[in-house]
Each structure stands twice: as structure tokens, then as C-alpha cells.
């Protein structure tokens, strides 16, 4: 059998291999050692017994899409049946105190490979033997601790294969410089050690994509915006656009990246080298946002110009044809740069919203029949922008972290946007008050610290930022400026 007979449904063409030469990979026309690595078709009854206690699942993931020329990394993780795990020696053991259908196991081992490998007859003293080889006969690499690696992974794509000895998780990186653009298929077959041979335990496949477009994502955020994912934002407040470039192999690390923005509101083009930009829309409506990212990245060198055509020679003496009969143009081993582009387009809607909220006055309310532990305080609030439809107050500890009470209620506010919010405080002390005004599209927040005095008639009201004062005194509460923080990870700058 050949590798393509074992690993794929169809024999890949030589054309596919020639057009996608992967460094360090081998042609799937090579012979497969079926004696050492038996081949079972899908549905073969032997799969049922390929693993003690159930089936092993292989999960294949990649960091696709990959910009052509960059590395793409594939990770295979083996998921064992319930209660099974790989130990430090590479043996498969039952987890302690874990109960599966078979109950608790007396034997701690599912597979004790250490014991098997110590029985090392047939080896020639170097640790090399006829069974420590891959399906194509190549010997296992003798890394430190290689004996604890009991799984053989065979990766197959584009008519080529790559063999790897590993534990329950392996990763393989492939350079995509010679890979045809578009979606491709990666298939992985996993074998486990079984005495002096191997047994297939899992097969998995996944599509990956190679592209010449920089994969670009943009996050959009705005203070007071109620829902950042609906692409509806508020007029007269800056929107922060943050560009994330998917470049897990850091291919573009040394590239100069330019960001060209068109916000769709006739403000022209804005070119920046910063991945973050702020823009304020001053009109309501729907706008088409366009971003072009440009990076000078390592790329193929253009072929040298062809020599001038020679006049036909009278003698038909052809030179040796063996070297390069197909004229496969060589790509010089130079560091050429090529401009790569990425694009992002979004339609965003701009609406009125609550732009700002301020507490302008805080008043202790005199109660005719004071409760033993209760104080009422009125907050006089103003806002700018659209008219709020609800108000929420969150009362918490002085650090503003532990919520003690949260109340939301509808409000009916006139055009002046002046309202009084009355809230009860249980007991004396310092409180953090978060006050939020909201409508359909926006939420505006302000915070203040307030000090509620003892109800002891002898004591006077204490404020957060002042000395004493009478019960009816009006005081300015200490303001806490509040900003929503967005944390992003970037590969660049």
C-alpha cells in the first residue's frame, strides 16, 4: 500500500504535490508498512477494540487562516474515554476516585507502556529496533524521553505526509510559501504503541485556508453605547476602532503596517500607522466604513526578465533536457518584499444618545418619622443628549466593588433633562453610588462617594468631601470619573 491509499479517499495528483511543496514533508506515493501499521477501513469491527474502555477522539485545530508565506500551526489533542489520562511517563492511567461505567478500576493502568519498552529484546543497544520506525520505515528520532512518546501521528495534506512521534498532544507547523491559495484539507491518522507494532486509534480531518489577504478584524467601542455588537453608535461621542490582525506566527512582525480609513461621512481618507483610531460622527444616519490595511511583507521575488529571443539556429541541437524539462522558474533566495492588503467593511448606524450625566446636588431628606437605620438621599441629576427612559442606581461599598443594592426604574424626563432620584441607605457609613441613565441605544454612567451619618440625634451629617453640616445642608459629593476600559491584544506596535 502507498500512503495515499491509507490516508486519503483519493490519490492526489503529482500536479498537486509539485505545486505545493512542503518543506520536510514526503510524497504520499511512498510505501506504507502495513505489517507494522495495520490499515482499517471505516466501519471495520476492529476499531471497536482499538482502545480499552471506549473510543479515543482526536481533535484537530489550526490557527487558520494563514497569510501565504507565514507558518500555519496544527494541533492534535487526544481525548481519552472518561476517567483516563496520560501520566508523566506517557502511560495511560485511570484517574483516582473517578467512576465510569465499569466502576472503579483495581488496575491503575489502562496501558503501561513503560513495562513494555523495558522488555527490549530485538534492539541493538542504540535503542533502535525494527519496530521503532515510522510507517515509511524512517527511524524514530531519539529526543530525550522519546520512550515516553507512545503515539504516532501521520499528517497528510496536498499529496504529502509528515510523521511525528508524540504524547497525547502534538503540534506541527507548516510554512505556506508554496501552498496554493484557498481552502485545503489536512487529515491526521493516529496510532498507538501495541507491543512490537501499532494500532490505529483515531482519524480526523480539518479544512484550513491560505490567503494572500491579511486577515483583519475590527472591534468598535464607544463610551455610553449600550450594545457594542449591534453596529449602532451614538452621535457626538468618539468611537474607538481597534484593528486586530490575525498573524499567529508573527509573519508581519517586522512589517510597516498602514491603516487607511474611510468613515463614509465625507471626512475624507485618514491614514495612520496606529492600529487604534477614534472618530466622531456628527450626523445621524447610516455610514459605510472601509478600512484597507497595507503591509510590506516578505514575499516571492518576481522572476528575472526573460532573455531577448534568440534567432532560430539552423542546427536542431538541443541541450541536455534532464535538468529542468518543464521550465519551473526558480524563485531566487532573496529577501523580497511584497505589499499585502487586508480589507474590512462595515455599515454603522449613528443615532442620538445620552452623552453625559452629572449629579449636581445631593440632599439628605428629612423624615418626619425617622426609621432606626434608614436614610433617604435625593440626587439631582442632569444629562446631555437624548432623553433617558430609565434610571438605575447601584449602591456598593466604598471601593465600588461589592454591590449592596441595585434598583432600576422607568423615568419620565422633560427636554431640560433634570431629574431627582431618591434612594434609601441602610445604616451610616461611606457608600459608592453608580447612577446610570439609559435609553434604547445608550447608557451613561456617573459615580459618586457619599457619607451617611449616624442617626444618633447628637451626631451631625458627615459628607464625603467636607466637614460637618446641618441635616438640610446641600453638599457636593466626591466625584469618581468613570471610563470603560477595553483590553485588546495586538501583534504589532
Amino acid at each position: 500500500k502507498r500512503f495515499h491509499d491509507v490516508l486519503g479517499n483519493e490519490r492526489p495528483s503529482a500536479y498537486m504535490r509539485e505545486h505545493n511543496q512542503l518543506n520536510g514533508w514526503s510524497s504520499d506515493e511512498n510505501d506504507w508498512n502495513e505489517k507494522l501499521y495495520p490499515v482499517w477501513k471505516r466501519g471495520d469491527m476492529r476499531w471497536k477494540n482499538s482502545w480499552k474502555g471506549g473510543r479515543v477522539q482526536a481533535v484537530l485545530t489550526s490557527d487558520s487562516p494563514a497569510l501565504v508565506g507565514s507558518n500555519i500551526t496544527f494541533v492534535v489533542n487526544l481525548v481519552f474515554p472518561r476517567c483516563q489520562k496520560e501520566d508523566a511517563n506517557g502511560n495511560i492511567v485511570y484517574e483516582k476516585n473517578c467512576r465510569n461505567e465499569a466502576g472503579l478500576s483495581a488496575d491503575p493502568y489502562v496501558y503501561n507502556w513503560t513495562a513494555w519498552s523495558e522488555d527490549s529484546d530485538g534492539e541493538n543497544g542504540t535503542g533502535q529496533s525494527h519496530h521503532n520506525v515510522f510507517p515509511d520505515g524512517k527511524p524514530f528520532p531519539h529526543h530525550p524521553g522519546w520512550r515516553r512518546w507512545n503515539f504516532v501521528y501521520v499528517f497528510h495534506t496536498l499529496g504529502q505526509y509528515f510523521q511525528k512521534l508524540g504524547r497525547c498532544s502534538v503540534r506541527v507547523s507548516v510554512n505556506t510559501a508554496n501552498v496554493t491559495l484557498g481552502p485545503q484539507l489536512m487529515e491526521v491518522t493516529v496510532y498507538r504503541r501495541h507491543g512490537r507494532a501499532y494500532v490505529p486509534i483515531a482519524q480526523v480531518k480539518d479544512v484550513y485556508v491560505v490567503t494572500d489577504q491579511i486577515p483583519v478584524f475590527v472591534t468598535m467601542s464607544q463610551k455610553n453605547d449600550r450594545n457594542s455588537s449591534d453596529e449602532t453608535f451614538l452621535k457626538d461621542l468618539p468611537i474607538t476602532f481597534d484593528v486586530l490582525i490575525h498573524d499567529p506566527s508573527h509573519f508581519l512582525n517586522y512589517s510597516t503596517i498602514n491603516y487607511k480609513w474611510s468613515f463614509g461621512d465625507n471626512t475624507g481618507l485618514f491614514v495612520s500607522i496606529n492600529h487604534t483610531v477614534n472618530h466622531t460622527y456628527v450626523l445621524n444616519g447610516t455610514f459605510s466604513l472601509n478600512l484597507t490595511v497595507k503591509a510590506a511583507a516578505p514575499g516571492p521575488c518576481p522572476p528575472p526578465p526573460p532573455p531577448p529571443p534568440r534567432p532560430p539556429k539552423p542546427t536542431p541541437s538541443l541541450g541536455p533536457a534532464g535538468d529542468n524539462p518543464l521550465g519551473l522558474s526558480e524563485i531566487p533566495d532573496e529577501n523580497c518584499q511584497i505589499n499585502r492588503y487586508g480589507h474590512f467593511q462595515a455599515t454603522i448606524t449613528i443615532v442620538e444618545g445620552i452623552l453625559e450625566v452629572n449629579i449636581i446636588q445631593t440632599t439628605d431628606v428629612l423624615m418626619l418619622v425617622p426609621g432606626p437605620d434608614s436614610s433617604l438621599i435625593d440626587f439631582v441629576v442632569t444629562c446631555q443628549g437624548s432623553i433617558p427612559t430609565e434610571v438605575c442606581t447601584i449602591i456598593s461599598d466604598p471601593t465600588c466593588e461589592i454591590t449592596q443594592n441595585a434598583v432600576c426604574s422607568p423615568v419620565d424626563v422633560d427636554e431640560m433633562c433634570l431629574l431627582t432620584v431618591r434612594r434609601a441607605f441602610n445604616g451610616s457609613g461611606t457608600y459608592c453610588v453608580n447612577l446610570t441613565l439609559g435609553d434604547d441605544t445608550s447608557l451613561a454612567l456617573t459615580s459618586t462617594l457619599i457619607s451617611v451619618p449616624d442617626r444618633d440625634p447628637a451626631s451631625s451629617l458627615r459628607m464625603a468631601n467636607s466637614g460637618g453640616g446641618g441635616l438640610n445642608d446641600i453638599f457636593e459629593a466626591q466625584k469618581i470619573e468613570w471610563h470603560e476600559h477595553h483590553h485588546h491584544h495586538h501583534h504589532h506596535h
Epitope: H19, D212, P300, S329
Partner: antibody, heavy 119, light 107 residues
């Protein structure tokens, strides 16, 4: 939809060169190899070579090696095939054809360009 | 180079009857073989790729079969519009090569 539009018919003298263009639209130009296939009057199809618009790698059939040059203009999504030292047996319809991913079968063809070599 | 031998050179079949065209390759190209239909003054049109896969929009009276070095294109019930020249092409390796063509006519 995918379209390959070729340049018009040419009449050339023996020994001259001809440059045929093939303008692609309706797909990502750099993602697919472009091939050239010719057909002499009343004869079968003959593959001449291919070019990758992304990196301008080329493969030419041995028969045309040294006489054919395939080039790309990415800005206009156009592929060119230049054949030099023309002789009468080069009289043919020249087609550009787009391969599909890693498979060299041709679902999309240009309309063809007749090149006549005559003294 | 892989040599493609197509047979017969021409074929006359009654309307509604079966037409069979063969293509033999000088080495194993399985399953990388395509079939095309060409009418006068037009570029070829892809019918079958990878031996047996019918291309989008191709009527199901066209089918491809075979493996290794022997392949067949079958038109199960010949229609008037099927009159054309049919070519096989190996897409296994470069240089890509075509068969000499089979002319299908109505008897």
C-alpha cells in the same frame, strides 16, 4: 461570474513574436494558476504551460521552452503569453484556461485568439 | 510525458442510443482524468473531472468511469446537441496532455 476575455486575432510573419492577453474577472485573480492551450486548425488540444499570478512561477511544456514567456499584470488582472520565433505551424487558436485550486482541469476558458503565421 | 490514446477517432450513434468513448494513458493517472466537449468555433467545455465527477450543470446522461490507465466517457442517450468532438485530458502531472479527440455524429 468568472470571465476570461482574450485579445483579438493576430496575423504575424514567420520569425516574429506575438503577445496574447487574457483578462480575468469575477474571482480572486491571484488564487488560481492560468494555463495556455492551443489548437491548430482541425487538430487537437495542446498544453503550452502555466503561470501562477500570485508569485509568477511558470511551468512550460518542453516543446515551447525558450520560445514562450508567460507574464502577469496584477493591477489589471491580466495574463500574457508571448510566443517568439513564429513559424507557420504555430498558426492556431490560443486559449487561456483557469485551473481549479490544486486540480489542473479547466472549467473556465477564454474565447480563444486566432494567431495566423504567414509570409 | 504521459501519452493519451483516445478511441475511436469518430463515432456515429443513433439518437437516443448509447455512445462510449475510451481513453488509455501510458501510465497510471487515476483518478486524475477529465473529459471535455468542443463544438466548432467554441472553447472546450468541461464535462467530467477526476475520472467520474460530473461538472456543475452537465446533464446526467454524461458519465465517466475507469481507473489506472483505462477510462471511459459514456453518453447514455445521445441527443442532437451532443454532436461535438470529445477530448480526454490527464490532470495528474505536468506537462498536461490531451487525447487526440473523438468526433461524435448522429447516424
Amino acid at each position: 461570474q468568472v470571465q476570461l476575455v482574450q485579445s483579438g486575432a493576430e496575423v504575424k510573419k514567420p520569425g516574429a513574436s506575438v503577445k496574447v492577453s487574457c483578462k480575468a474577472s469575477g474571482y480572486t485573480f491571484t488564487s488560481y494558476w492560468m494555463h495556455w492551450v492551443r489548437q491548430a486548425p482541425g487538430q487537437g488540444l495542446e498544453w503550452m504551460g502555466e503561470i501562477n499570478p500570485y508569485d509568477q512561477r511558470t511551468n512550460y511544456a518542453q516543446k515551447f521552452q525558450g520560445r514562450v514567456t508567460m507574464t502577469v499584470d496584477k493591477s489589471t488582472s491580466t495574463v500574457y503569453m508571448e510566443l517568439s520565433s513564429l513559424r507557420s505551424e504555430d498558426t492556431a487558436v490560443y486559449y487561456c484556461a483557469r485551473s481549479t485550486g490544486n486540480y489542473a482541469w479547466f472549467a473556465y476558458w477564454g474565447q480563444g485568439t486566432l494567431v495566423t503565421v504567414s509570409s | 510525458d504521459i501519452v493519451m490514446t483516445q478511441s475511436p477517432d469518430s463515432l456515429a450513434v443513433s439518437l437516443g442510443e448509447r455512445a462510449t468513448i475510451n481513453c488509455k494513458t501510458s501510465q497510471d493517472v487515476s483518478p486524475s482524468l477529465a473529459w471535455y466537449q468542443q463544438k466548432p468555433g467554441q472553447p472546450p467545455k468541461l464535462l467530467i473531472y477526476s475520472g467520474s465527477y460530473r461538472y456543475t450543470g452537465v446533464p446526467d446522461r454524461f458519465s465517466g468511469s475507469g481507473s489506472g490507465t483505462d477510462f471511459t466517457l459514456t453518453i447514455s442517450s445521445l441527443q442532437a446537441e451532443d454532436v461535438a468532438v470529445y477530448y480526454c485530458q490527464q490532470h495528474y502531472s505536468i506537462p498536461l496532455t490531451f487525447g487526440g479527440g473523438t468526433k461524435v455524429e448522429i447516424k
